[in-house]
Amino acid sequence: KSSNEATNITPKHNMKAFLDELKAENIKKFLYNFTQIPHLAGTEQNFQLAKQIQSQWKEFGLDSVELAHYDVLLSYPNKTHPNYISIINEDGNEIFNTSLFEPPPPGYENVSDIVPPFSAFSPQGMPEGDLVYVNYARTEDFFKLERDMKINCSGKIVIARYGKVFRGNKVKNAQLAGAKGVILYSDPADYFAPGVKSYPDGWNLPGGGVQRGNILNLNGAGDPLTPGYPANEYAYRRGIAEAVGLPSIPVHPIGYYDAQKLLEKMGGSAPPDSSWRGSLKVPYNVGPGFTGNFSTQKVKMHIHSTNEVTRIYNVIGTLRGAVEPDRYVILGGHRDSWVFGGIDPQSGAAVVHEIVRSFGTLKKEGWRPRRTILFASWDAEEFGLLGSTEWAEENSRLLQERGVAYINADSSIEGNYTLRVDCTPLMYSLVHNLTKELKSPDEGFEGKSLYESWTKKSPSPEFSGMPRISKLGSGNDFEVFFQRLGIASGRARYTKNWETNKFSGYPLYHSVYETYELVEKFYDPMFKYHLTVAQVRGGMVFELANSIVLPFDCRDYAVVLRKYADKIYSISMKHPQEMKTYSVSFDSLFSAVKNFTEIASKFSERLQDFDKSNPIVLRMMNDQLMFLERAFIDPLGLPDRPFYRHVIYAPSSHNKYAGESFPGIYDALFDIESKVDPSKAWGEVKRQIYVAAFTVQAAAETLSEVA
């Protein structure tokens, strides 16, 4: 199934021509252009950038480029009433205040409109009280505090270190524990690679650097005021009290210099074990409250941010397909940034820009893809994936009928060690085949394929000689396409060495120091890793849009379904007595997986043999492939998460960033030993096994011969 067989094809208009047209120097130039001023969602600067991108995509040769606007709930600090945290003495006097802004990086001292660090969507409030250190504020951290250490967070202000899980989950956990405020901070243990200098001398986080970010728990809802529907001109908006996912307690982020001042005075219980200690020179006592000499001092938060309905703008570009214009392959990444966006998102947006330019060059020479390619520059991703979700809500009927694949294009790099791919199993073979054709940019792998360096540096834990490909979680714009609509999705970027760098994300994530210079000086001076990511993302889009038979292998889904069934069964088998008592059986699920495996195998055989010159049969087979991902969607959604509808994958209920397999069963089993009504709890497990087994069987049947 060569890509050379598209309409109006000339031999030079193939994948190679597309890839050869991609240039590192252009990506560098585009990155510079996109990072000179902040492009915060809802601001005039970001609207201007949207119009610039619209204009340039038109120049590049796309058939049409439109702006799609929505009026969504955003959050901003109060410009005249800044947010901060104090230590107050017994008289209520503020004896220490956290900083109001990050010291600007060299060369950016005179830039206006740098939003100070804040937790987007924090409610207003000025709570004061004793501090409790809650480690990463994960579910297991609160279990340790409440169950083992008998520490009650009710009425306390908790301080949690960033990392390990999505910040929104931390806030949700703190709320459930009864906290009245949350302070988030970046510990050097997680955001400072030992031995590397801090910015501007290296890529580490300085003590005054702070991670911004939203703290929502949207569970895929999009705009908090219009869940399920687009936030358009005639939208009905919920009242703020009914808005989806808003936190109920004040939250604020700080850097490690300020965190040191709060943590050094902590008293109460010692940390339960070394995993609760970061790298600061403080005891990491849990509290509650300060130690002896300082026991009368309290912590007070001053949060004055406001939630405002604000207009956002997506840019949607179309390159019409020549043969199947009603089949859409989408390449999308966001444009809005917290400040300069040197990595997040502009390292991705610059790559998208160059991919559009390359496709446009081919189109100007008379070529068209077989299927339509849609390019998207999403707005307000940082505020909860709002731009992509609203657009998908507005176009859901078209997308569920016509959506072939979605390739995400946020940050192109989070390191410069090796490739990282998360995708649907349907794309495994596409990714393997593509990376075997691309050159590795890695030192020591000159003349070797990307597949080879990737496999060597990031081997699959299950299959020798193959690279690791991870499950899709969330926290990015593929969410609505994959988790809600069931459109096959994937993402790729260059990453760090997770073995040696255990910090979370990259150190300067969402700080003012995420600049063009950070990338150009420290991460990718030659822009060779950006170019490789452009080749991977662009190559995937090219193949998905152009190959005669869709490059999906349903047999790979069969393999992972068996793996996931084994995994969830082994979790359940930690409770053998209860499984016996409540007659819990996984037979139906294993049977469905077996059927899926057999039917997928037969489908793959038919796929090799059918008459590709028969357009009706070709379309039929491709539709079965396209709709396979859709078949894993349960229209009722997961319990209490109606917009997470994929039965095989969902974002973890404990960490939005991570993907969980058979999430319905997993959540039903989670902490089941603590449930007050075990009969009801195990009944829910049985129901979730039923839903999963039915869904896998139903999906298998979509691959059966149609008649």
Epitope: P188, D201, P206, Y256
Partner: antibody, heavy 124, light 107 residues
Framework: QVQLVQSGGGLVQPGGSLRLSCAAS????????MSWVRQAPGKGLEWVAN????????YYVDSVKGRFTISRDNAKNSLYLQMNSLRAEDTAVYYC?????????????????WGQGTMVTVSS | AIRMTQSPSTLSASVGDRVTITCRAS??????LAWYQQKPGKAPELLIY???SLQSGVPSRFSGSGSGTDFTLTINSLQPEDFATYYC?????????FGPGTKVDIK
């Protein structure tokens, strides 16, 4: 190569003043905290003072507070110790040292580069 | 201020010996401890930081261990160039403080 070259020691009377200098080369001076450490004749090492990269934070051992001032000139890659109201017990070899903040931007994890030392004798 | 003590104050050993020096802090300093070697008339040299991490260029016969209040410097097979005075230093809190030193001399 990375080095610290000291100057400015000597003999001074009690109550007198002296200014020590330390010239850095071979590394980005403005990226490091710097320190002064002293060693009285035949005795052990004693940390004297620390200064942050941009000079915005300074710390001193109690025995020199109010008498000694640590400063730096990043344009000249130089560190200074202004010593006033000198006492006999300040007699020592004074070392300038680079602070190594291996684990994070802090007042330091260790002293990884040292000057050759300069002798300060306070005697009448 | 945190008080640092070292033992022994003097240690006589032969080439090839395994030598152990201990350092104790008056309060918990976690892992924030460094070890230095100083030869007569010379500036100290950093051997170990963060209790157990070997400074670049330092021979692997030197090793450090411990956390909290008790720490150890071990020289696995003493070489002629290792006869010197060794100091521990805490960097947990200002004022930074050194131990009084351990002199390793030839038996």
């Amino acid at each position: 190569q990375v080095q610290l070259v000291q100057s400015g020691g000597g003999l001074v009377q009690p109550g007198g003043s002296l200014r020590l200098s330390c010239a850095a080369s071979g590394f980005t001076f403005s990226s490091y905290w710097m320190s002064w450490v002293r060693q009285a004749p035949g005795k052990g090492l004693e940390w004297v003072a620390n200064i942050k990269q941009d000079g915005s934070e300074k710390y001193y051992v109690d025995s020199v507070k109010g008498r000694f001032t640590i400063s730096r000139d990043n344009a000249k890659n130089s560190l200074y110790l202004q010593m006033n109201s000198l006492r006999a017990e300040d007699t020592a070899v004074y070392y300038c040292a680079r602070v190594w903040d291996y684990y994070y931007d802090s007042s330091g994890d260790a002293f990884d580069i040292w000057g050759q030392g300069t002798m300060v004798t306070v005697s009448s | 201020a945190i008080r640092m003590t070292q033992s022994p104050s003097t240690l006589s050993a032969s080439v090839g010996d395994r030598v152990t020096i201990t350092c104790r802090a008056s309060q918990n300093i976690y892992g924030w401890l460094a070890w230095y070697q100083q030869k007569p008339g010379k500036a100290p040299e950093l051997l170990i930081y963060a209790a157990s991490s070997l400074q670049s260029g330092v021979p692997s016969r030197f090793s450090g261990s411990g956390s909290g209040t008790d720490f150890t410097l071990t020289i696995n097979s003493l070489q002629p160039e290792d006869f010197a005075t060794y100091y521990c230093q805490q960097s947990y809190t200002i004022p930074f403080t050194f131990g009084p030193g351990t002199k390793v001399d030839i038996k």
